[in-house]
């Protein structure tokens, strides 16, 4: 009778994570007497996967009924495959012996590769906001996929970006892989409503890529523009000065009025007008009793936006000669009117 041969017909098998993997093995003979064992890997460090003789292998089932004498099929099925199960599996025939069974012949091995889906991409932006015309970095990360081949693209408002760098780790063989990509995006004033999208394509996704998004509203700061103007008044002893704060983002804004450098009033922006591009407008006014002033008044609108250094705009309010003559009798009193919204610009 010809010497026993161990036949593993498939060089490789690919299975999706969570499924069962069938590893095929056949013998040409039942001689010599002794058990069949399955191992992952070769050499001294190989891992026992199944032993016909003994042991408890809850994830392994034999494809055929091994207690039937004419059975030469020693294929096994491993349930609930994970990326950690990837490797080369060997079907090995042992000859009964002591103190240990003696390895008689091994199959050529079957490489099990596990197709594992990448995790949902997580996109994160810069830790601090930046202003238009500056470049900010966004990162995209996804983990746990296999095989290694993967495609990552970046988009801003549907337009593909080209300024990015991507790494897949580890560089060598592994049970699963991670991808990390950094994209550089130049901010524009209109980016409050913009989105960056990281798109990942992988064999396990069957043409339906995964996407992670980040809003540029989290990364951008649009500083306000200030305009101080005097509004016409019926009463000749009062002046109405407005400070128009325009096109800023985010909302956080504190405004201070100064008369000749002295703080007159501080207020926090509340009722804002939102522009179509996502920025905000706000207007504050100051009623000045001109009778209280003998000389011209410099009114300053000082704005602190989003914790940044204050910006200001001044307006010189001229006191007429007639008002100066009568002014000495007037008690110094600045009438401060409440703020009122100004129509939003679009």
């Amino acid at each position: 009778e010809d010497e026993l041969q161990v036949i593993q017909p498939e060089k490789s098998v690919s299975v999706a994570a969570g499924e069962s993997a069938t590893l095929r093995c056949a013998m040409t003979s039942l001689i010599p007497v002794g058990p069949i064992m399955w191992f992952r890997g070769a050499g001294a460090g190989r891992e026992l996967i199944y032993n016909q003789k003994e042991g408890h292998f809850p994830r392994v089932t034999t494809v055929s009924e091994l207690t039937k004498r004419n059975n030469l099929d020693f294929s096994i099925s491993i349930s609930n495959i994970t990326p950690a199960d990837a490797g080369t599996y060997y079907c090995v025939k042992f000859r009964k012996g002591s103190p240990d069974d003696v390895e008689f012949k091994s199959g050529a091995g079957t490489e099990l590769s596990v197709r594992a889906k990448p995790s949902a991409p997580v996109v994160s932006g810069p830790a601090v906001r930046a202003t238009p015309e500056h470049t900010v970095s966004f990162t995209c990360e996804s983990h746990g996929f296999s095989p290694r081949d993967i495609t990552l693209k970046w988009f801003k408002n549907g337009n593909e970006l080209s300024d990015f760098q991507t790494n897949v780790d580890p560089a060598g063989d592994s049970v699963s892989y991670s991808i990390h990509s950094t994209a550089r995006v130049v901010l524009t004033r209109g980016d409050v409503h913009s989105q960056v999208i990281c798109e990942i394509a992988h064999i396990t996704l069957q043409g339906d890529p995964l996407r992670g998004t980040a809003n540029l509203s989290e990364a951008i700061r649009v500083p306000p523009t200030l305009e101080v103007t005097q509004q016409p008044m019926r009463a000749e002893n009062q002046a109405n000065v407005t400070c128009q704060v325009s096109n800023f983002y985010p909302r956080g804004l504190q405004l201070t009025w100064l008369e000749n450098g002295n703080v007159s009033r501080t207020e926090t922006a509340s009722t804002l007008i939102e522009n179509k591009d996502g920025t905000y407008n706000w207007m504050s006014w100051l009623l000045v009793n001109t009778c209280a002033h003998r000389d011209d008044v410099v009114l300053t609108c000082q704005v602190e936006h989003d914790g940044q250094q204050a910006v200001s705009k001044s307006y010189a309010l001229e006191i007429s000669a007639h008002q100066k003559e009568h002014g000495s009798d007037i008690t110094h009193e600045a009438a401060l009117a409440p703020t009122a919204p100004l129509g939003g610009s679009g």
Epitope: P35, I36, K53, E54, K68, R69, N70, N71, S98, D100
Partner: antibody, heavy 118, light 107 residues
Framework: EVQLVESGGGLVQPGGSLRLSCAAS????????MHWVRQAPGKGLEWVSA???????YYTGSVKGRFTISRENAKNSLYLQMNSLRADDTAVYYC????????????WGQGTMVTVSS | DIQMTQSPSSLSASVGDRVTITCRAS??????LAWFQQKPGKAPKSLIY???SLHSGVPSKFSGSGSGTDFTLTISSLQPEDFATYYC?????????FGQGTKLEIK
């Protein structure tokens, strides 16, 4: 049903011969290692002989050269030809099937009595 | 040849008792050890193979353990039908050899 039935036992004089038969049913005898085990009256079990699926044969020291194990696949039967019988060969002889992969005994016949006496 | 030694040679016990029979091999036999039960005038019955695996149809009150040279057979709760003679056997290499037997009797 898997079954082994021995026959051929009896009374024989010392130096005589006897041929034991074991008819197998419910399985193909040639696919298994097959054995003969004996038990002298009031004594324990003693393995006597075996034949492997490849036709390889094995014997215990005391019967070597006197006993021959064989099988006939067409009849699905196992045999033990016993020559030069001695008084200490007196025993119940059991036909036994070896297990699938490790040759552990799993199926036993009911036994046949061999008495060697003058 | 490999010698197999059983102890005790005989054992008296009561119904419901838990009993243990030991078997020692003269050399390492891996775990190629079987246990058999035999009742008077009957053929032996296979109980356990590879030291701890139960043959089909054998009740779980029978259990085996051991590897190398020392082995045990345990019957967890004796029933009247369990009183018999028990044999161990090594089948790692020819000639296969049996222990001398342990007779389990009702106390």
């Amino acid at each position: 049903e898997v079954q082994l039935v021995e026959s051929g036992g009896g009374l024989v004089q010392p130096g005589g011969s006897l041929r034991l038969s074991c008819a197998a049913s419910g399985f193909t005898l040639s696919s298994y290692d097959m054995h003969w085990v004996r038990q002298a009256p009031g004594k324990g079990l003693e393995w006597v002989s075996a034949i492997g699926t490849a036709g390889d044969t094995y014997y215990t020291g005391s019967v070597k050269g006197r006993f021959t194990i064989s099988r006939e696949n067409a009849k699905n039967s196992l045999y033990l030809q016993m020559n030069s019988l001695r008084a200490d060969d007196t025993a119940v002889y059991y036909c036994v099937r070896g297990g699938v992969w490790d040759d552990a005994f799993d199926i036993w016949g009911q036994g046949t009595m061999v008495t060697v006496s003058s | 040849d490999i010698q197999m030694t059983q102890s005790p040679s005989s054992l008296s016990a009561s119904v419901g008792d838990r009993v243990t029979i030991t078997c020692r091999a003269s050399q390492d036999i891996n775990n190629y050890l079987a246990w058999f039960q035999q009742k008077p005038g009957k053929a032996p019955k296979s109980l356990i193979y590879t030291a701890s695996s139960l043959h089909s149809g054998v009740p779980s009150k029978f259990s085996g353990s051991g590897s190398g040279t020392d082995f045990t057979l345990t019957i967890s709760s004796l029933q009247p039908e369990d009183f018999a003679t028990y044999y161990c056997q090594q089948y790692v290499s020819y000639p296969y050899t049996f222990g001398q037997g342990t007779k389990l009797e009702i106390k």
